[in-house]
Interface confidence: low
């Protein structure tokens, strides 16, 4: 607020025109830079005689109060006008002059001391910075305000951005408010159009198209963004996108491969892990179908190892003692050695073994070499009582005490030497490289069980109790057909899947019989020379409860999935797979389909020159490849027969295989007891 | 959808050949195998042979020496050819899709071995 | 070769009556396939791999078994079933089929 009168003389008393509250009147809205609106005097010739009157009566001649009412016609102004008056008069007419003069506004004479008394406007009672103009009234004033302005004084700027009838003062953005105006301003990234109101965005992409560098700019009310794919962050500095290492970030509980873009967790499969649902923790990879591996000592097991003898005894016996081996056999093989016999100095030998299913019978000694293959096929699962026995002009083989073969000889199988008939007898193998004296070649590998043998009639003393110890080389107790991949290792076989009379230049068809014991692991994989794996078909627990999902992949693509398969369970699954460079067909007990779709074009043509170089085929799981190489890198666990290509897999044949998989033997599924 | 039908002679003398074409659509001979199987009149069926897609062919022992399957990719074709029909000859002769088990089977071609 | 005989050979069952017939192989087999024959028709896919019904085959069929018996069920005989049903073994070459069993409706 202003201070008034700041021209009183300095020994006066100063009056301050003070607007009492109730004589205020509010302007409105549309009034708000007007003039306050006063009752004054309706002529100004009538301004100009009070004028002269005042000269004349108060001036010129000294008036009493009474003389003033007179000039004024009115009591209000005349009570304001005669106490200053007499201020006046005191000041000029009591020699006060000096005093007067030297204050600051002093008036000059009386009469202008008196004539200014009567104009409000003398001194300036408006706000300097918002009056237009200032007029006088009968003891009062009017203040004409400036736009922006209002208070009986324009002593208050109107803030237009408030103002309810114009909201933010029509700015679309910022509205700041100055004294006696307002202007609108924008946000950064904004500009002002002509309007002086609106803000329109900057589009700084377009402005400045190498703004993100590499990165994707993007354009935001008032900003823009560079946007990086997935897996990438925005580099300031280089304006680029970088990938982002989660592995840094410890995001996997196991294996982690970052990759551009993105990243993989992988779980050890060979160590009996899998990723669990959140594709970053790993757990143990569970058993869905129990099976009953219980194993009896008392049954030998012949496959323990895939290449070698499982056991071998020496015999030394007096001359007259004659060759003789019966013994309870048990398998689902085809082929294989049950027993080699031979002198001490190898120039003599006996072959038991299995070809066809049937007893076969090799033999060589100085006097002859002869084979017979005869009797039933006793590759039936069933325990079958195999006695061959050597009699004084021939040697008669015998199953279930039943004569099948009767083999002539001239003479002794095996010579005795200083009285004593020394013979050295093997089990389910041979114990050197004996392929090239064979009468005819035979695949040596036998998966097959044998119990309450007796050896030259020596009965079982002294086996039994190394067989005893060790656990490998005991037989499980039931068995069914197949072959048992144990989770912990492979089969590899070199198969040519190259056809030159097809006009698609390979194929390769598998049918698998499956009938896991756990639900994930890799079934079969064809492998590159380069650590690939240009196809492969595993199991994956499916996110549908006690289901299995089928997954074909093309190296660590899966191309396709088969969902929800009820494959843990006693009964057996046929699957079948047709592969070429062209297409994918499958069958499995739902449905028999084609699959095509654009993406497996790309990923067979993938398939397609890896197919043209050498692959190799593993059964059961992986080499040593990369973690990242398949989608799955765990052990198969369970039974499963493989026809590659019309034939069937026989992992005798096998380039290598682990010891503990089962050729042609697989536990039975384990049945829950009433006593369990 | 899948569709197979036969195209045969009807009468053929007896010591003379038979071809039969089983034309199909739906399907590429590329990726399914298709089987010849026969139906005497009033009897059961008896399988003859089929060609895999990849071409190669399997027969039923006791006609193989008289029996050649054969195929055209390209035209949707398979051939049959048997060599010195009998009597015993006459049968009802299906072709069927055969993807491990024949699952769509033509309508026949009815062969009567007849002087 | 496999021969598969089925039984019964002719048959006639009275609708809502269970019906079961019967294939027995001389050796084992890993799976049997059935087929549905009616008069003048060719034969259809009905049962494959011992226990997968073909598609568009009523849920009351069903096929089992193992080794060297298998068989296929109707759990309630209806009209439309009155039919020639032959099983078929593809284990060993040459896939062989049984000779039939005429199922009529009483």
């Known amino acids: 607020m202003r201070v008034l009168g700041g021209r009183c003389g300095a020994l006066l008393a100063c009056l301050l025109l003070v607007l009492p509250v109730s004589e205020a009147n509010f302007l409105s809205k549309q009034q708000a830079s007007q003039v306050l609106v006063r009752k004054r005097r309706a002529n100004s010739l009538l301004e100009e005689t009070k004028q002269g009157n005042l000269e004349r009566e108060c001036i010129e001649e000294l008036c009493n109060k009474e003389e003033a009412r007179e000039v004024f016609e009115n009591d209000p102004e005349t009570d304001y006008f005669y106490p200053k008056y007499l201020v006046c008069l005191r000041s000029f007419q009591t020699g006060l002059f000096t005093a007067a003069r030297q204050s600051t506004n002093a008036y000059p004479d009386l009469r202008s001391c008196v004539n200014a008394i009567p104009d409000q406007c003398s001194p300036l009672p408006c706000n300097e910075d918002g009056y237009m103009s200032c007029k006088d009234g009968k003891a009062s004033f009017t203040c004409t305000c400036k736009p922006g302005w209002q208070g009986e004084k324009c002593e208050f700027d109107i803030n237009e951005c408030k103002d309810p009838s114009n909201i933010n003062g029509g700015c679309s953005q910022i509205c700041d408010n100055t004294p006696g105006s307002y202007h609108c301003s924008c946000k950064n990234g904004f500009v002002m159009l002509s309007n002086k109101k609106d803000c329109k965005d900057v589009d700084e992409c377009s402005l400045k198209p190498s703004i993100c560098g590499t990165a994707v700019c993007k354009n935001i009310p008032g900003d823009f963004e560079c946007e990086c794919p997935e897996g990438y962050r925005y580099n300031l500095k280089s304006k680029s996108c970088e990938d982002i290492d989660e592995c840094s970030e410890n995001m996997c509980a196991q294996l982690c491969v970052n990759y551009p873009g993105g990243y993989t967790c992988y779980c050890d499969g060979k160590k009996g892990f899998k990723l669990a649902q959140d594709q970053k923790s790993c757990e143990v990879v569970s058993v869905c179908l129990p099976l009953n591996l219980d194993t009896k000592y008392e049954l030998l097991y012949l496959a323990e190892q895939f290449a070698g003898v499982v056991l071998y005894l020496k015999f030394r016996l007096p001359e007259i003692s004659r060759f003789s081996a019966e013994f309870d056999f048990r398998t689902y093989d085809s082929e294989g050695v049950i027993l080699y016999a031979e002198s001490i100095d190898h120039s003599a030998w006996l072959l038991i073994a299995l070809r066809g299913g049937k007893i076969e019978v090799q033999l060589k000694n100085e006097h002859t070499s002869k084979i017979t293959t005869g009797g039933d096929v006793i590759n039936n699962g069933l325990w079958n009582m195999v006695s061959v026995e050597e009699l004084e002009h021939s040697i008669s083989i015998k199953i279930a005490k039943e004569a099948v073969m009767d083999i002539n000889k001239p003479g002794p199988l095996f010579k005795p030497e200083n009285g004593l008939l020394e013979t050295k007898v093997y089990f389910a193998g041979f114990p050197r490289k004996v392929e090239s004296e064979l009468i005819k070649p035979i695949n040596p590998r036998l998966d097959g069980c044998i119990r309450s043998w007796n050896l030259m009639k020596q009965g079982a003393s002294g086996i039994k109790e190394i067989i005893q110890e060790k656990q490998n080389k005991h037989c499980l107790v039931t068995v069914e057909k197949g072959s048992y991949y144990p989770g912990s290792g492979i089969a590899q076989f070199h198969i040519d899947y190259n056809n030159v009379s097809s006009a698609e230049g390979w194929h390769v068809n598998v049918t698998l019989n499956i009938r896991p014991s756990t639900g994930t692991g890799v079934m079969l994989a064809l492998v590159s020379g380069n650590n690939t794996v240009p196809f492969a078909v595993s199991l994956v627990d499916s996110t549908s409860e006690k289901s299995q999902d089928i997954l074909l992949s093309v190296e660590n693509t899966v191309i396709y999935r088969i969902q929800a398969l009820s494959l843990c369970s006693d009964q057996q699954s046929h699957l079948e797979f047709r592969v070429n460079r062209n297409n994918l067909e499958l069958s499995t007990p739902l449905k028999i389909e084609t699959i095509s779709h654009e993406d497996l074009q790309r990923q067979l043509a993938v398939l397609d020159k890896a197919m043209k170089a050498k692959v190799a085929t593993y059964l059961g799981g992986l080499p040593d490849v990369p973690f990242s190489a398949t989608p799955v890198n765990a052990f198969y666990n369970g039974c499963m027969e493989v026809n590659i290509n019309g034939v069937q897999l026989d992992l005798d044949e096998a380039i290598s295989k682990h010891n503990d998989i089962r050729a042609h033997s697989c536990p039975s599924v384990w049945k829950k007891t009433k006593n369990s | 959808q899948v569709h197979l039908k036969e195209s045969g002679p009807g009468l053929v003398a007896p010591s003379q050949n038979l071809s039969i074409t089983c034309t199909v659509s739906?399907?590429?001979?590329?990726?399914?195998?298709v089987s010849w199987v026969r139906q005497p009149p009033g009897k059961g069926l008896e399988w003859l042979g089929m060609?895999?897609?990849?071409?190669?062919?399997d027969y039923n022992s006791t006609l193989k020496s008289r029996l050649s399957i054969s195929k055209d990719n390209s035209k949707s074709q398979v051939f049959l050819k048997m060599n010195s029909l009998q009597i015993d000859d006459t049968a009802r002769y299906y072709c069927a899709r055969d993807p491990g088990a024949m699952d769509y089977w033509g309508q026949g071609t009815s062969v009567t071995v007849s002087s | 070769q496999i021969v598969l005989t089925q039984s019964p050979a002719i048959m006639s069952a009275s609708p809502g009556e269970k019906v079961t017939i019967t294939c027995s192989a001389t050796?084992?087999?890993?799976?049997m396939h059935w087929f549905q024959q009616k008069p003048g028709t060719s034969p259809k896919l009905w049962i494959f791999?011992?226990?997968n019904l073909a598609s568009g085959v009523p849920p009351r069929f069903s096929g089992s078994g193992s080794g060297t018996s298998y068989s296929l069920t109707i759990s309630r005989m209806e009209a439309e079933d009155a039919a020639t049903y032959y099983c078929?073994?593809?284990?060993?070459?040459?896939?062989?089929f049984g000779g039939g069993t005429k199922l009529e409706i009483k």
């Open positions: 050796s084992s087999v890993t799976y």
């Open positions: 078929q073994q593809r284990s060993s070459y040459p896939p062989t």
């Open positions: 791999s011992t226990s």
């Open positions: 739906g399907f590429s001979l590329t990726g399914y195998g």
């Open positions: 060609i895999w897609g990849d071409g190669t062919t």
